[in-house]
Structures are given as C-alpha cells and as structure tokens.
Amino acid sequence: YHGCPSECTCSRASQVECTGARIVAVPTPLPWNAMSLQILNTHITELNESPFLNISALIALRIEKNELSRITPGAFRNLGSLRYLSLANNKLQVLPIGLFQGLDSLESLLLSSNQLLQIQPAHFSQCSNLKELQLHGNHLEYIPDGAFDHLVGLTKLNLGKNSLTHISPRVFQHLGNLQVLRLYENRLTDIPMGTFDGLVNLQELALQQNQIGLLSPGLFHNNHNLQRLYLSNNHISQLPPSVFMQLPQLNRLTLFGNSLKELSPGIFGPMPNLRELWLYDNHISSLPDNVFSNLRQLQVLILSRNQISFISPGAFNGLTELRELSLHTNALQDLDGNVFRMLANLQNISLQNNRLRQLPGNIFANVNGLMAIQLQNNQLENLPLGIFDHLGKLCELRLYDNPWRCDSDILPLRNWLLLNQPRLGTDTVPVCFSPANVRGQSLIIINVNVAVPSVHVPEVPSYPETPWYPDTPSYPDTTSVSSTTELTSPVEDYTDLTTIQVTDDRSVWGMTQAQSG
C-alpha cells in the first residue's frame, strides 16, 4: 500500500502501525496517503526534523510507550491536517517551544505519563483549536499564568498525578468552554478563591488525593453546570456553610477520606440530581437534624468508618428515595426509634461494627422494603419483640458476634430465628454469650431451659409463625449485599484513570460492587 515499511503493518483504511524494540527511528518510507500512524513500544529515543513530511494527510499520530526523550522543534512540520497527537508514555522532560506550531487542526494533545518538569505559555499558544489536553502523570510543580490562555475551545484538561503545590487563581480564567478539569493526585494544599470562576461550563472537577485542608466558601459558586465533584482523600476538616449551595446539577460528590468532624444542617444545598454521597473515612461524630434534607433524590449514603456516636432523630429527613444506608464501623450505642422513619424506600442498612446495646422496637417501623440488615459485631443482648415482623422482603439478616443473653427472654427471638433461618445465611450463626453455661452455643438451637431464667419472665409472644423463604436461592446480583467483593472507593468514571482497585477488603461499607454504581 504505497510503500509500507517492513517493520510496520499498513491497512487498506490508511492506517499504519509500527511496533517493536528493533525500531530505533521513524520508519521510512511511510505511505503518502496514511491518515493514522501509530508508533508503539519501540526504542526510538528522538524525533528529528520533519520525519512526517511526506504524509501531510495524517489525522491521527500516536507515538506512545517508546524511549523518546528528545524532539526537534520542527518534528511535526507539514501536519496541518493532524487532529489527534499522542506522545504519552515516553521519557520527555522538555518540550521545545514551537513544537506544535502549524498544527492548526489539532484537537487532542496527549502528553501524559512523561517526565515533563514545566510548561510555558508559548508551548500551546498556536493550538487555538485544541479541545483536549492531557498532561497527567508528569513532574509539573507549577503552572505559569497564561499557560492555557489561548486554548479558549478546550473542553477537557487533565493535570492529575503531577507535583503541583499551588494553583494561580488566574490560570484557568479563559477556559470558558472547559467541561472536565482533573487535578487529582497532586500536592495542592488550598485552592484560591476565584480559581474556578471562569469555568462556567465545567461538568467534572477532580480534586481527589491532594492535601487540601480548607475550601473557600465561594469556590464553586460560578460552576452551576458541575455534575461530578471529587474531593475525596484530602485533609478537609470543615465545609463552609455555603460551599455547595450553587450546584443544582451535581449528581456525584465524593468526600470520603477527609478529616470532616461535623456536617451542618443544609450543608448540601439543593442538589436534586445527587444520587450518591460518599462520606466514609472521616471523623464525623454526630449527625444533626436535616443535614441531608436537600438531597431528595439521594439513593446511596455512605457514612461508614467515622466516629458517629449520636444521630439526631431528624438527621435523615428528606431522604425519601434512599436505598442504601451504610453506618457501619462507627461508635453508635443507641438509636432513636424514629431515626429511620422517613426512609420509606430503604433496602439495605449496614449497622455492623458499632456499639449498639439495644434497638428500639419501632426502629424499622416504616421501612417495610428492607431486604438486608447488617447488625453483626455490636453489643446486642436481645432484640425487641416483633422488630422484624413486618419486613416481608427481608432476605439477609446478620446477627452474629453479639453478646446474646440466652435466658427465657430470648425465646421469642429464638423462635423467630428458627423459622427464618434462610435469612441468616449459612456462614456464621449468632451464638449465646451469657449465661456462661451456654456460652458459644447457637442461639437458634439453644435449649433455653438450661439457661438461667431471667428475673422478668414474659409470656412467650411469637415473632411471625410462618417460615419465610426467598423465592430465589440468592439475593439478585444487582442488589446483593453479601459483603464479598467491594470497592475501596467509588469508581470515579474516568476513561484515563489508570488504577481502579477492587479489593476483597470487607470494610468499606458492607455492600457489594454491584451497588457502587
């Protein structure tokens, strides 16, 4: 096909691919009609003057995963039709000024995963049509003012995984068309007020895995179109009352892995589209009334691995659409009987790894659709009569690792469990802790007559007498709560995120991968 180099493969569709360690220079001659050229996994160390001079019709050029460390300024001369240029995964430390001159059609420029130490305004001053600029995975320590001033059409900018310690409030001011800005995995400690004010079309802002301690109150006030805001794994200790007030389009907000101690009522200002809120791994100690009341469409609320010891009865007001509530691994000792009353659509609740010593009889009174309740590893000695009676959809109930007191008061619970064993699972059953003569025996099969009778012996009313068996042998995969495979963090929907770890760590929020969205 018009002279394909021996070390390359050329297709009818004008696509050329040159790969292999034996390649040490750009192969020649390249087909004059080539529209796509890929040079991958070679030992090319430099690009000299005009190696692509005779393929002026080229639209896409990928020079990736090579040993490339030096580029001559005129390397891309005569590529006026080029729309896509990737130099990702090379060893570039310096970009020559004028390298991209003449690339008037360039829309996507990928410079990620190199060793770039700095960028200058002159680097991109000719790239007025650029829509996407990927600079993540370099060694950039600062971005000079004016670096992006000519990129007025830019819609996606990735500066993640660099060494940025601060950002000038003026650096993004001309990027009015920007939709995605990623600054994750840097060393930012604060973001100056006004930094994002010019980004009126921003839809995604990724600031996770920095060292941000404080958010300015009006930091996001101009970003009315923001849909995804990632603030996880920073050092944020408090949220200014108005910080999220102007974000009506937000549908994803991650705040896990910070140092938040409290959440003030109304902090999550009207966010009618927010479906998930991740707040695990903070230092939250209490939840006041109405703290989530603006989140009318919230379906997943993750508050696990905090230090919550008190939940106000109205803390979950407004969460009428909530499906999953994770409160595990906190310091809860008591729960008000009305605390879950508003959660009419709740399906799964994780309360394991707390210090709950008793539950009010009406705790699940209005939550008729509950399918899974995790209560293991608490301090429960008994449960109130009829606490699960009305939960016809309940198919997973975890009660093990509690100090069950197997005196005659336990009989109603024991009888109900006996009739509803499929709900308990087969892996681990609840065992008696006291009296000592029955310690370690299964609560379900214990002969209560051997146990010491309690001081107060009630009549033995019944939990539901009809055995309940689920229609299917296992909980449907789409809503499973079997705590087997979980995400350590929500998948932050990146096409260019390189590591999304899935682990078997059964500790994040007591629910499965399927529920993480």
Epitope: Q352, N353, R357, Q358, T428, P430, V431, F433, A436, R439
Partner: antibody
Framework: EVQLVESGGGLVQPGGSLRLSCAVS????????VHWVRQATGKGLEWLGH???????NYNSALMSRLTISKENAKSSVYLQMNSLRAGDTAMYYC??????????????WGQGTTVTVSS | DIVMTQSPDSLAVSLGERATINCKSS????????????LAWYQQKPGQSPKLLIY???TRESGVPDRFSGSGSGTDFTLTISSLQAEDVAVYYC????????FGGGTKVEIK
C-alpha cells in the same frame, strides 16, 4: 482445661513485620472471641484488637493501619499480623479470651505472652 | 478514643489497711439504657499475666476475694482493697469498654 499459648515473638528489624500465633485449647474459636493486648517493659497495658467467634474484627484506632487479626478455627489458632514495625512496638504480646466473665469485653483467661523486640 | 487516667501512680499501704485507687475517664462510661458503667479493673502481679477483678464498675468476678470492691459511675471510679494482704502487691489497671477498650496507665500497690 482452657489454655492460650502465644508464639512467634523474637527479634525483628525496624520496618519489618511479625506474625504472632495464639494457639487455644479447651474451647472453640467458633464460640469465643480472642483479644490481643501488649505491654512494653515497665509500661501499661495496651489493647490491640480482637476477633469474635463469627470472624468480625475491631482494632485499636492508632494501630489499625498496621494490624490484621485473623484466625483458623480448624487449627484453633488466632494470628496477629503487624507491619512497619518500629522500636516502640517492642513489648510482651498477650492473647486473652472471655471464658466465664459476664463482661463481653472482659478478659478472664490470658496466655503467658510472647516477647517481641524491634531492633537493628 | 476515651482516655483513662489513674491516680495515684503508686501507693504504699500497710498490711491490713485500706488501699484506694482512682480512675477517671474522658467521657461518661454509663449507658443510660442498660444502666451499666462499662469499666473493669485488672490486677497484674510481677512476672504474671493480668487478671480480671471487677467489671461493670462494681461486679466482682467469680473467685475474687470480697476485700476487692469497685464503685463509681459516669466518669469517676474507685477500686478499694479494704484490708491489704501481702498477695495484693501488684499493678492495678482500669479499662473502659464503653467504646473500644482502652486501659488506664496503672497504679502500683506496695506494702509500707
């Protein structure tokens, strides 16, 4: 007779890790929980964590990132894995259980301890 | 975490005399619903493993001599040895289990 026997102590390099074992007899790990507690020479007791009969674990928050407690019921053994060791981890390490006490977090049967020394 | 502070650090008492050890917690250990104080006392003799003496602030473990008694509620607790015996020479620790357990620093009891 109820017994808990710790093993696995010894000299460990700073930055290294250790895996201590607690072999129990006279009771089943499917019925009883086990705690780990340590004590530096001449110092007080420090609770490290526990594992309950069903396998749930809790940890001292200050050490959580470096600790893992696990068990093998069939082998009647509980394990303490500790990483990134430093000189301050030098101590006698005990395992204990709640055999008779009515206190769920009470520790009324203890092993004799195993000594861990972290030094280069 | 709940911090447990014991006083005094050490105590010398004549045989047959009363020994009193105090323990203060940084927050209340009383659960209002169970009406229990989640505080225990342990004794550790030289070269031995600790031994549980008292739990729920005032309930003596079986086999513990009645000269040992515990009292207090909320944040302030006391272990009393009404008539000190030679075999009571030991370090005494309080421990809270209201939240995940933490021990006090210990009080050394010696014979004067």
């Amino acid at each position: 007779e109820v017994q808990l026997v710790e093993s696995g102590g010894g000299l460990v390099q700073p930055g290294g890790s250790l895996r201590l074992s607690c072999a129990v007899s006279g009771f089943s790990l499917t019925s009883y929980g086990v705690h780990w507690v340590r004590q530096a020479t001449g110092k007080g007791l420090e609770w490290l964590g526990h594992i309950w009969a069903g396998g749930s674990t809790n940890y001292n928050s200050a050490l959580m990132s470096r600790l893992t407690i696990s068990k093998e019921n069939a082998k009647s053994s509980v394990y303490l894995q500790m990483n990134s060791l430093r000189a301050g981890d030098t101590a006698m390490y005990y395992c204990a259980t709640h055999m008779i006490t009515e206190d769920y977090y009470g520790m009324d049967y203890w092993g004799q301890g195993t000594t861990v020394t972290v030094s280069s | 975490d709940i911090v447990m502070t014991q006083s005094p650090d050490s105590l010398a008492v004549s045989l047959g005399e009363r020994a009193t050890i105090n323990c203060k917690s940084s927050q209340s250990l009383l659960n209002s619903r169970t009406r229990k104080n989640y505080l225990a006392w342990y004794q550790q003799k030289p070269g031995q493993s600790p031994k549980l003496l008292i739990y729920w602030a005032s309930t003596r473990e079986s086999g513990v001599p009645d000269r040992f008694s515990g009292s207090g509620s909320g944040t302030d607790f006391t272990l009393t040895i009404s008539s000190l015996q030679a075999e009571d020479v030991a370090v005494y620790y309080c421990k809270q289990s209201y939240n995940l357990p933490t021990f006090g620093g210990g009080t050394k009891v010696e014979i004067k």
